[in-house]
């Protein structure tokens, strides 16, 4: 019989059950903005806004310094007395729009949803490694704001993002709102906006540039704002937003703004569409060419990529590339297919693609029926037209109008369809070594660390824990402080390493110690922990073989036992080769003789199942006595494999020495022809692994084997006549004399 | 140690203007907020006004508001305090005092000014 | 503006005695905002209390603040004869910021 080891689940090795505790901080209500500081002078500090308060934390997350940012019209509200004496608008919360750091200062900028939106800067003030705030100034100059003109108006209510460039001396502030019509009518904020910082820090600049809504689209066309960044010499806004000015409003798409950082000013303010989409490696009948598409941007992160992810999107390491969350839609529960997909966008080439539709729209010889677009925000026109216009004059340039590209830049899922049912809700990608890693939120209040690699089966887990009791979803902005990423989740704000909270979740030496090495794992004994887990018996440099099982798990006492060894960290090579003299096995006090791998036998194991095997022939010692013993596998002096090399013993009780005792045989006779199927009874017939009835010297073939009875089906007789009659275990005779004579037919 | 040391008070008359200087020593400058705290004779502490580490804020009382402007210079570790308009009850020792929201900790010795005719 | 009132306006004690020193606010103050400072005659002001309740660098341990919202208190244990002079509660929640009109402790 041809007994295998049964497959172990990858995910055996692993338990993501186990419990890490994380340094948190409770907000007292939920987190509606987060920022983090880190000084040159190694002061660090985070930033905390909830409703009509703003938290200043040290890096331990130990609250340093409360400000109240709310009720407006509560006299108690720090920052609108800032303003002066009110009354200033309206009463009411301030629920934090815009949390953002102005590096120039430094000084840390927030907008509220009360006071027309407007926002208050806050000098940051470094003691020791401790950071406070500067009293607040008001960022609004009542002369200078109408309701129809108000550049000191930042933040809507339906949302606001911002991101702050230095430009010479002055600050710009790269702000993009969500807009409905009662917002576009109360102190008219707009959609898209470049503005300045006055010196006095008395507000902003008049006469800054913007892109809105047309009025007669702001009904029924609203744009979210999901991400902004700056990289290089531009600025871009993440949105969510209808395919269409005219048709279906609920059919939305993902869109990338790109905005110049060097220039304050909206001329070259483009659009791209980002189409990420699932394509199974198997395509399902009735599944979309091309593969499910996602259009709804859920999170985003940019950042540079290490060497293994660079090489799969044929790009150099270190190259910035923007990573998208993406669902079906705004519930994001899909009919089939995952949850949430993960798509990579190199900034590279969404440059060059945007740059290409530039030159598309406005070299000659001109594109018959190529739209500007954009027209939520201008006048329809065709390209090379500016907005409006029927053609260009002399003294106006292509180039310097907002233009959509045409084409949009599809991307495929990195994940493959593995994050499943995962709903991911934040996002922040690192690179650590040479491995790029994305650190995900989810909407049940967990956080995913996973390896952001294209070519497996299977997610490459750094963590995957439970931030905390509650199971809210955790919030769309991370932070990064230092070798720590902040999430938020309901009122409290969690600190986790980059590195992974622990080790404590890999469950074998052998997964412990193939743990990137930026996790610092190291195996304690009997668990996978960080060298200040167990300083005494941690090490990095071996495992222990491990066995699971073994079969059979009876042999007999005189005769071989050709015993499989199931487990792992037996070979560390595929091949399973083993050089002489590294293997030990021994049965009670027998030894068991390894024997060369069947290369016919070798299969490929899939890297989501392992397991491996090792086979010895035991030949028990004269003094082995019969009863239960244990199965002991000693591995030393092994070449060191990648990770590490195996060193140790493991030892597996529940094999038994057991005696076969032949007691009857019957008929004891039957037709030279042979075909008689014989019936011999006894105790342990069922024993090792190999047994043979002989008749006369030749086999009788056996059809059934238990532990008190055999069946064979007789060989033909040479004559008639009585011959011998014999069974052997593991090739040794059991004890008896038996003889069956063959009759004529 | 950490040093404000006050000077620029003198005799001025009503109408007229002095600027007052706070050198600072001992301590990272550029980190703290600093204020400016006045006493007239025999009576309370009065707070004036009040600087962000990097000048990006400035607050002043009711009584002195558009007649009075602090300014720093970080590269100099100096605070100033223009004072215009001068009138007889902002007759007074005017202290510098260092930090905010830990409270002002650090105080100078204080330099007198006299407005009289 | 936020109004701080102090009382009494004038303490009489004995060395050895515990001085319990009061400041009002005319609105909520929230503590992180509420300081203590203790001036003696020809001398400049010396912080002994920020945050309503930390004592600063160098202060005496019978020093001692307390309170929330609109009263605090400052208390002084156990008087020691350098401990006779005028006392200012302060906030900088608010702009602009005030000072107490101060209690000044003097030796019975």
């Known amino acids: 019989e041809d007994w295998q080891c049964p497959r172990t689940p990858y995910a055996a090795s692993r338990d993501f059950d186990v419990k890490y505790v994380v340094p948190s901080f409770s907000a007292g209500g939920l987190v509606q903005a987060m920022v983090t500081y880190e000084g040159d002078r190694n002061e660090s500090a985070v930033f905390v806004a909830i409703r009509n308060r703003l938290h200043v934390l040290g890096p331990d997350l130990k609250s340093v310094q409360s400000l109240a940012t709310g009720p407006a019209g509560d006299p108690g509200c720090q920052t609108c007395a800032a303003c002066g004496p009110g009354p200033h608008g309206p009463p009411g919360d301030t629920d934090t729009k815009v949390l953002v750091l102005d590096p120039a200062l430094p000084a840390l900028v927030s907008c509220g949803s009360s006071l027309q939106g407007r926002c208050f800067l806050h000098d940051l003030e470094p003691q020791g490694t401790a950071v406070h705030l500067a009293a607040p100034a008001c960022l609004f100059s009542a002369h200078h704001n109408r309701p129809d003109d108000c550049p000191d108006c930042v933040a809507s209510p339906l949302g606001t993002r911002v991101t702050v460039v230095e430009q010479g001396q002055a600050s710009y502030f790269y702000v993009a709102s969500s807009l409905d019509a009662a917002v576009a009518a109360s102190f008219s904020p707009r959609s898209v906006s470049i503005r300045r910082l006055k010196a006095d820090a008395s507000g902003f600049a008049p006469g800054f540039v913007a892109l809105s809504v047309l009025p007669k689209h702001l009904v029924s066309y609203s744009i979210e704002y999901v991400h902004s960044f700056h990289t290089g010499a531009f600025v871009y806004f993440l949105t969510v937003q209808p395919a269409s000015v005219t048709d279906d409003p609920s059919a939305l798409h993902t869109r990338l703004a790109r905005l110049s950082a060097t220039e304050p000013e909206l001329g070259d303010y483009r659009e791209l569409v980002l189409d990420c989409r699932f394509a199974p490696k198997r395509r399902r009948r009735g599944a979309p060419e091309g593969g499910q598409p996602y259009p709804v941007l859920r999170v985003a992160h940019s950042a540079p990529v290490g060497a293994q992810l660079a090489t799969e999107l044929s790009i150099a390491e270190g190259q910035e590339v923007l990573f998208g969350v993406f669902v079906t839609g705004k519930d994001g529960g899909p009919g089939v297919g995952p949850n949430s997909v993960v798509c990579a966008f190199p900034i590279d080439l969404l440059d060059t693609l945007i740059d290409e539709g530039v030159e598309r729209c406005c070299e000659s010889p001109v594109h018959p029926g190529l739209r500007r677009g954009l027209d939520f925000f201008q006048s329809p026109s065709f390209c090379p037209n500016p907005p409006g216009l029927e053609a260009l004059s002399p003294n106006t340039s292509c180039r310097h109008f907002p233009l959509l590209v045409s084409s949009s830049f599809s991307r495929v899922d990195l994940f493959n369809g593995l994050l499943g049912p995962v709903q991911v809700t934040a996002l922040y990608v690192t690179r650590l070594d040479n491995v790029t890693v994305a650190h995900m939120g989810t909407m049940d209040g967990r956080i995913l660390q996973v390896e952001l690699v294209r070519s497996l089966n299977y997610l490459l887990y750094v963590s995957n824990f439970s931030l905390g009791d509650s199971g809210q979803p955790v919030q769309r902005d991370v932070s990064r402080l230092g070798d720590h990423l902040l999430f938020a989740s309901g009122d409290q704000v969690f600190q986790v390493p980059i590195q992974g909270p622990g080790c404590r979740h890999f469950l074998t030496c052998g997964r412990c110690l193939r743990a990137w090495h930026f996790m610092g794992c190291g195996w304690c004994g009997n668990m996978c922990g960080q060298q200040k887990e167990c300083p005494g018996s941690w090490q990095q440099d071996h495992c222990p073989p491990k066995l699971t099982e073994f079969h059979p798990h009876s042999g007999p006492l005189r005769g071989s036992t050709r015993l499989t060894l199931c487990g792992s960290n037996f070979y560390l090579h595929p091949s399973g080769l083993v050089p002489e003299g590294t293997h030990q096995v021994t049965v009670g006090q027998s030894p068991c003789r390894p024997l060369p791998k069947d290369s016919s036998k070798l299969r490929p194991v899939p890297r989501k199942d392992f397991v491996e095997e090792f086979e010895c022939e035991l030949e028990p010692l004269g003094t082995q006595a019969v009863g239960p013993t244990n199965v002991s596998l000693t591995v030393t002096n092994m070449p060191p494999g990648k990770h590490f090399r195996v060193d140790g013993t493991s030892v597996l009780r529940g094999f038994s020495f057991m005696e076969p005792v032949l007691i009857a045989v019957q008929p004891l006779f039957g037709p030279r022809a042979g075909g008689t199927c014989l019936t011999l009874e006894g105790q342990s017939l069922s024993v090792g692994t190999s047994r043979a009835v002989l008749v006369n010297g030749t086999e009788c073939l056996l059809a059934r084997v238990s532990e008190g009875q055999l069946l064979c089906a007789t060989p033909p007789g040479a004559t008639v006549a009585s011959v011998p009659l014999s069974l052997q275990v593991g090739g040794a005779q059991v004890p008896g004399s038996w003889t069956f004579q063959y009759r004529e037919d | 140690q950490v040093q404000l040391v006050e000077s620029g008070g003198g005799l001025v008359q009503p109408g007229g203007s002095l600027r007052l200087s706070c050198a600072a020593s001992?301590?990272?400058?550029?980190?703290?907020?600093m204020s400016w705290v006045r006493q007239a004779p025999g009576k309370g502490l009065e707070w004036v006004s009040y600087?962000?580490?990097?000048?990006?804020?400035?607050y002043y009382a009711d009584s002195v508001k558009g007649r009075f402007t602090i300014s720093r210079d970080n590269s100099k570790n100096t605070l100033y305090l223009q004072m215009n308009s001068l009138r007889a009850e902002d007759t007074a020792v005017y202290y510098c005092?260092?930090?905010?929201?830990?409270?002002?900790?650090?105080w100078g010795q204080g330099t007198l000014v006299t407005v009289s005719s | 503006d936020i109004v701080l009132t102090q009382s009494p306006a004038t303490l009489s004690l004995s060395p050895g005695e515990r001085a319990t020193l009061s400041c009002r606010a005319s609105?909520?103050?929230?503590?992180?905002?509420l300081g203590w400072y203790q001036q003696k005659p020809g001398q400049a002001p010396r912080l002994l209390i920020y945050?309503?309740?930390n004592r600063a660098t160098g202060v005496p341990a019978r020093f001692s603040g307390s309170g929330s919202g609109t009263d605090f208190t400052l208390t002084i244990s156990s008087l020691e004869p350098e401990d006779f002079a005028t006392y200012y509660c302060f906030q900088a929640l608010i702009m602009p910021f005030t000072f107490g009109q101060g209690t000044k402790v003097e030796i019975k």
């Open positions: 945050g309503a309740s």
């Open positions: 005092a260092r930090g905010y929201f830990h409270g002002m900790d650090y």
């Open positions: 609105q909520s103050v929230s503590f992180d905002y």
């Open positions: 001992g301590f990272t400058f550029n980190s703290y907020s």
């Open positions: 600087i962000s580490s990097r000048s990006s804020t400035t």
